[in-house]
């Protein structure tokens, strides 16, 4: 806590500027007023406070600014922006795709990503949509990025904005975030030609149900085992060993190599240990031959 | 890892000199900024002296005219020349560094252990 003083009549500040960095912590909080401070935001990145009078200074805006600093302020931050808790973020109202590169580029090389991913969602409500200027700026400032947003947020993404969206910035997308995006890829890439199609979709297909795995094992695509790997169990889970083989073609030896990881190792418990021969792969752990299997889900709904 | 580390220090009597040196690895002074602060028992820690291309070279009022702040770029060194020392002097001295950014403002600061000055007779 900074303790309160008064202002010695020598030490009075009537602009910010690097004369400042003499003052003690004590002296900037009683010297230093906070109206004036965000009136020339502007000029305070330009001087090297230590850490430790940054605190002040962010004190004395979090004083003047209980409810959120206005986006006139949050612009100019600079460096000050890492002294920024998500706490402290969530009061803001950003709208401007300035304001978010300018902090964006502050933040890069320091350990900031829970800032970041709540700054992204301010500019997403403040924006009322994830439009394609803001996908634009998150791609190219901020990879991977995206991934950052709840599923709720990412529901805002027109599918025309899709397009803009680039493989690696998919990269740390969870399960739940796909299963938003991916309905968005396919409605965004449904006119194009099979090929340049699954180009397009793979990224997504984390997303993808069991029919439309299925649908694509009937494409000759050549699914490659990183993109199958990255399939919901679900929607592996019901695939033949015929539809595998189909979809992953030239690449189904590579399951050997995944046996033991899902999705591929619950994939073989569920297959027949004979169809699973036919491979030629030795994959092992299907189920032998003669047994009956019980689906007992279906059963219990029943009753 | 960037590493400060502060030498010089000791015990000197009123009126006398000391030459504090601060070595830095991992960053170069020349185009960020270096400075010396110093804190006295009980008292908060302030700037005593500071260079950077940037600001150029400032000093706190107190040791304007008795201190000089300098750099040896082979070295890779910030130097404190304190001349003229009185008790108000005695304190722990720290050498500090920050990265000057390319796209203007700064980044990373380090700070050394620090060095106690002991000024009395």
């Known amino acids: 806590d900074v303790e309160r003083t008064t202002c010695p009549p020598e030490k009075e500040v009537h602009e910010i500027d690097e004369s400042l960095i003499f003052y003690k912590k004590r002296e900037l909080e009683a010297c230093v007023d906070a109206a004036l401070l965000a009136a020339q935001m502007d000029r305070v990145d330009a001087i090297p406070f230590t850490y430790e009078q940054l605190d002040v200074l962010k004190h004395k805006l979090d004083e003047l600014y209980p409810q959120g600093y206005p986006e006139s302020v949050i612009r100019h931050l600079g460096h000050l922006f890492l002294k920024m808790s998500p706490e402290d973020i969530r009061k803001w109202n950003v709208t401007s795709l300035e304001t978010l590169k300018a902090l964006l580029k502050v933040s890069k090389g320091h350990e900031m990503s829970a800032q970041v991913a709540t700054l992204i969602d301010r500019v997403v409500v403040g924006r009322g949509q994830l439009d394609k200027d803001t996908v634009d700026t998150l791609t190219a400032f901020c990879p991977g990025c995206l991934c950052s947003l709840s599923p709720e947020r990412l529901s805002s993404v027109p599918p025309s904005v899709i397009g803009a969206v680039r493989p690696q910035d998919l990269d740390t997308c969870g399960p739940r975030q796909l299963d938003v995006l991916y309905p968005k890829a396919r409605l965004a890439f449904q006119n194009m030609s099979g090929s340049e199609y699954f180009v397009k979709i793979r990224p997504f297909l984390g997303g993808a149900p069991t029919e439309d795995v299925k649908a694509l094992s009937q494409q000759n695509v050549s699914m490659d085992l990183a993109t199958f790997m990255k399939l919901r169990r679900e929607a592996v889970l019901p695939l033949t060993v015929a539809e595998v083989q189909k979809l992953l073609g030239p690449h189904v030896e590579g399951l050997k190599v995944e046996e033991q990881h899902s999705p591929v190792r619950d994939w073989i418990l569920k297959q027949r240990q004979d169809d699973l021969d036919t491979l030629g792969l030795g994959l092992q752990g299907g189920i032998p031959n003669g047994y009956l299997i019980l689906d007992l889900s279906v059963r219990e709904a029943l009753s | 890892e960037v590493q400060v580390v502060e030498s010089g220090g000791g015990l000197v009597q009123p009126g006398g000199s000391l030459r504090l040196s601060c070595a830095a690895s991992?960053?170069?002074?020349?185009?960020?900024?270096g400075g010396w602060f110093r804190q006295a028992p009980g008292e908060q820690r302030e700037l005593v002296a500071s260079m950077s291309s940037a600001l150029g070279t400032k000093y706190a009022d107190p040791v304007k005219g008795r201190f000089t702040i300098s750099t040896d770029t082979a070295k890779n060194t910030v130097d404190l020349q304190m001349n003229s020392l009185g008790p108000e002097d005695t304190a722990v001295y720290y050498c500090?560094?920050?990265?000057?950014?390319?796209?203007?403002?700064?980044?990373?600061?380090?700070w050394g252990q620090g060095t106690q000055v002991t000024v009395s007779s």
């Open positions: 500090y560094a920050r990265v000057r950014l390319s796209r203007g403002g700064w980044g990373s600061e380090y």
């Open positions: 991992g960053i170069t002074f020349s185009g960020n900024y």
